[in-house]
Interface confidence: low
């Protein structure tokens, strides 16, 4: 199934010449950025990007790798070193501190320098670091957070929270001793630390008092409110803001995003994380692309610009389950959101970055034929004379023994959305990986994204590009299209 034209050297020479021509025409934009968008693919290592590219291409009836993703079209790329101050292989909390605040932290802490210690409440005060989103708000921009996880989850929390424990979602998760020392849960910080204009994702249950039934699952007690302090945080958030609207389903989101009277929007579409894209009820829950579009509609009204954080947060969850199908379909929806945002914004005034917080021990190998299913089998057999999949994990729940040996696998099994790819080491959850991840950039000052950088560089590029603290004396021309 090799395309005939690809057998001809002219095909490759022509294709490369076009790419070279485009590269030669690249002109670094010397203006400041009016808008900042950071797209965060949680757990989206380079192997995930490659595999998702092939899957997306194959969904369009192509062979796969030749069709670029939306993120592939960003002209500038760098590598980001993701380690935490105390760990070679990081978590999503301390990495969020790095790419959102510009300072590295310790494993499982958020919005704190490395002087703060995991789970030690009394090390919080004085060690807070301020996110670029917070700085953008102080500069008069509108700001938004969009995620497929809980809005209180580690990555989105990096935009607004300061906590020594990323798992302190609601006050019920915070030990009494820490509460007495004044440490606040992440949900409380969401509504009180700063004024966020758009908040979209999951995480309803952390906002309401214990015993409050969930509107979508009123008969399931486990999905109801978790708070012990009796607070209704959504109501408090609404009460503080003129023009605030709360929604919990797709229909209400679409209506609110078109309503000119809505100035602040909180949409929480699931009690916890949002459903995987393959399980999403499209009548009730919006997709990441739809949430991104709704956020951009509201944020774009501000003449001073906006900061938007968009997370494909469940790429990571799919990998932790060793279910590549879930991880890759989440990555494709993430890429769709990037594509839609590109249609709704201009690279003349918007700096868009795409990156991952960390990678996963997810591999793609075995010499599969071009055009064969990304979820398929390698052409040959392993030494145990059994088939193996081209996608595998170094560790995780996919390690299973059948009669003391590695089980055989068929193409129909491996193609199932529920299939767990095999791994070398048995773990309840597959782990993150420590290799560098890609950073893709487009728009004003995107040319600064080059080489191999610390993950913290990302936050500094955004701050500099928009002339935010500590780069208010950035000496950049005003963003394209502005008059002041």
């Amino acid at each position: 199934i090799i395309p005939v034209e690809e057998e001809n050297p002219d095909f490759w020479n022509r294709e490369a010449a076009e790419a070279l021509g485009a590269a030669k025409k690249l002109q670094p934009a010397q203006t400041a950025a009016k808008n900042l968008i950071i797209f965060l693919g949680d757990g989206m290592g380079v192997s995930t990007v490659t595999a998702a590219r092939i899957l997306k291409g194959q969904k369009k009836d192509k062979l796969g790798p030749e069709i670029p993703l939306a993120m592939d079209r960003f002209p500038y790329v760098a590598l980001s070193k993701t380690y935490n101050v105390d760990k070679h292989v990081p978590d999503s909390g301390a990495t969020a501190t790095a790419y959102l605040c510009g300072v590295k932290g310790n494993f499982q802490t958020i919005g704190l320098s490395a002087a703060a210690r995991f789970n030690q409440c009394n090390t919080t005060r004085g060690n807070e670091v301020i996110s670029v989103m917070n700085r953008a708000k102080k500069a008069g921009k509108s700001v938004g957070v969009v995620t497929t996880t809980r809005v209180q989850h580690a990555s989105p929390a990096g935009t607004y929270a300061h906590t020594v424990n990323r798992n302190w979602y609601s006050d019920a998760d915070v030990p009494a001793s820490a509460r007495q020392e004044g440490c606040q849960d992440i949900a409380t910080q969401l509504i009180s630390n700063m004024d966020i204009d758009v908040i979209l994702g999951g995480g309803r249950k952390y906002m309401f008092r214990m015993g409050t039934p969930d509107p979508e699952y009123p008969d399931d007690y486990s999905q109801g409110g978790t708070r012990l302090d009796g607070k209704n945080l959504v109501q408090e958030w609404l009460a503080k803001r003129q023009g605030a609207r709360y929604v919990w389903n797709r229909t209400e989101l679409m209506q609110a995003s078109l309503d000119p009277s809505v100035t602040h929007l909180m949409g929480l579409f699931e009690p916890g994380d949002m459903k995987y894209e393959i399980h999403r009820d499209s009548t009730l829950d919006p997709s990441l692309m739809e949430m991104t579009e709704a956020a951009l509609r509201l944020l774009s009204r501000n003449p001073r610009g906006f900061f938007l954080f968009v997370e494909g947060g469940r790429i990571d969850h799919g990998h932790h389950e060793s279910r590549a199908y879930r991880a890759l379909t989440e990555t494709i929806m993430f890429d769709d959101a990037i594509e839609r945002a590109g249609q709704l914004t201009s690279e003349e005034d918007t700096l868009s970055l795409v990156t991952a917080d960390h990678s996963h021990v997810f591999s793609f190998g075995g010499y599969p034929l071009r055009g064969s299913s990304i979820f398929g089998l390698a052409p040959g057999k392993a030494r145990d004379r059994k088939a193996y999949t081209v996608l595998l994990y170094g560790n995780g729940p996919g390690y299973v023994l059948k009669d003391g040996a590695r089980p055989d696998v068929t193409e129909s099994e491996s193609g199932s959305p529920e299939y767990r790819q095999q791994s070398a080491v048995p773990l309840d959850e597959e782990t993150h990986a420590g290799e560098d991840v890609a950073v893709f950039a487009r728009g004003p000052q995107a040319h600064l994204v080059h080489g191999v950088q610390e993950q913290t560089f990302i936050a500094h590029v955004m701050a500099f590009a928009a002339c935010l603290e500590p780069y208010t004396a950035c000496d950049l021309a005003p963003p394209a299209g502005t008059t002041d």
């Epitope: 309401f208 008092r209 409050t212 039934p213 509107p215 302090d229 009796g230 607070k231 209704n232 959504v234 109501q235 408090e236 609404l238 009460a239 503080k240 709360y246 919990w248 229909t251 209400e252 209506q255 309503d259 009277s261 809505v262």
Partner: antibody
Framework: EVQLVESGGGLVQPGRSLRLSCTAS????????MSWVRQAPGKGLEWLAL??????????EYSASVKGRFTISRDNSKSILYLQMNSLKTEDTAVYYC??????????????WGQGTLVTVSS | DTQMTQSPSSLSASVGDRVTITCQAS??????IAWYQQKPGKAPKLLIY???SLQPGVPSRFSGSGSGTDYTFTISSLQPEDIATYYC????????FGQGTKLEIK
């Protein structure tokens, strides 16, 4: 379980005053907007007054028909809502309900109601 | 002040019928409308809030729709226990109730 119990109603002469109480239980009283609504015999519902929650400094609002005569207040330590009614008129005869804002997300929609207390203004 | 005009003031329908009540606001209320059911001698009961959101525990035969100034409340298949008076409430700008619709069985 959310419970609202009104009391203080009864027969009162025109021009006199009366104070209604609404004792709340089963929820964190300070977190919720509270309102008074009345219903004259055989008539529809009429909203009278609102007192907001702790997050908004317990600010108050009134309908034009009672502004200046009625005062809404709350004793947060006892979880009691009050309606002080002065210069009563015969047209104030009604069942008076206290109502609590939504269990859910919009702090203003009236989701929980007491059983009502009857106020009769007559000479 | 926002005024709410509810119609009809009364209606008679048979069990199984589709019943529709409308409320018109004097200005855009941004979908902040709720619908209540009240039976004689009882307090009102919230059925629907924010135009179309069904309060938990309320049967799915009750629904709401609308935007701007025009809103509709529907009972898809009237049941004997639905006999009551129904009120709309706007809560965009403080509160205003509609005049009520008394629903009877034919």
């Amino acid at each position: 379980e959310v419970q609202l119990v009104e009391s203080g109603g009864g027969l009162v002469q025109p021009g006199r005053s009366l104070r209604l109480s609404c004792t709340a239980s089963g929820f964190t009283f300070t977190d919720y907007y509270m309102s008074w609504v009345r219903q004259a015999p055989g008539k529809g519902l009429e909203w009278l007054a609102l007192i907001r929650n702790k997050a908004t400094g317990y600010t108050t609002e009134y309908s034009a028909s009672v502004k200046g005569r009625f005062t809404i207040s709350r004793d947060n330590s006892k979880s009691i809502l009050y309606l002080q009614m002065n210069s009563l008129k015969t047209e104030d005869t009604a069942v008076y309900y206290c109502a609590r804002a939504s269990f859910y997300y919009d702090g203003k929609v009236l989701a929980y109601w007491g059983q009502g207390t009857l106020v009769t203004v007559s000479s | 002040d926002t005024q709410m005009t509810q119609s009809p003031s009364s209606l008679s329908a048979s069990v199984g019928d589709r019943v529709t009540i409308t409320c018109q606001a004097s200005q855009d209320i941004n979908k902040y409308i709720a619908w209540y059911q009240q039976k004689p001698g009882k307090a009102p009961k919230l059925l629907i809030y924010y135009t179309s959101s069904l309060q938990p525990g309320v049967p799915s035969r009750f629904s709401g729709s609308g935007s701007g100034t025009d809103y509709t409340f529907t009972i898809s298949s009237l049941q004997p226990e639905d006999i009551a008076t129904y009120y709309c409430l706007q809560y965009d700008n403080l509160y205003t109730f509609g005049q009520g619709t008394k629903l009877e069985i034919k």
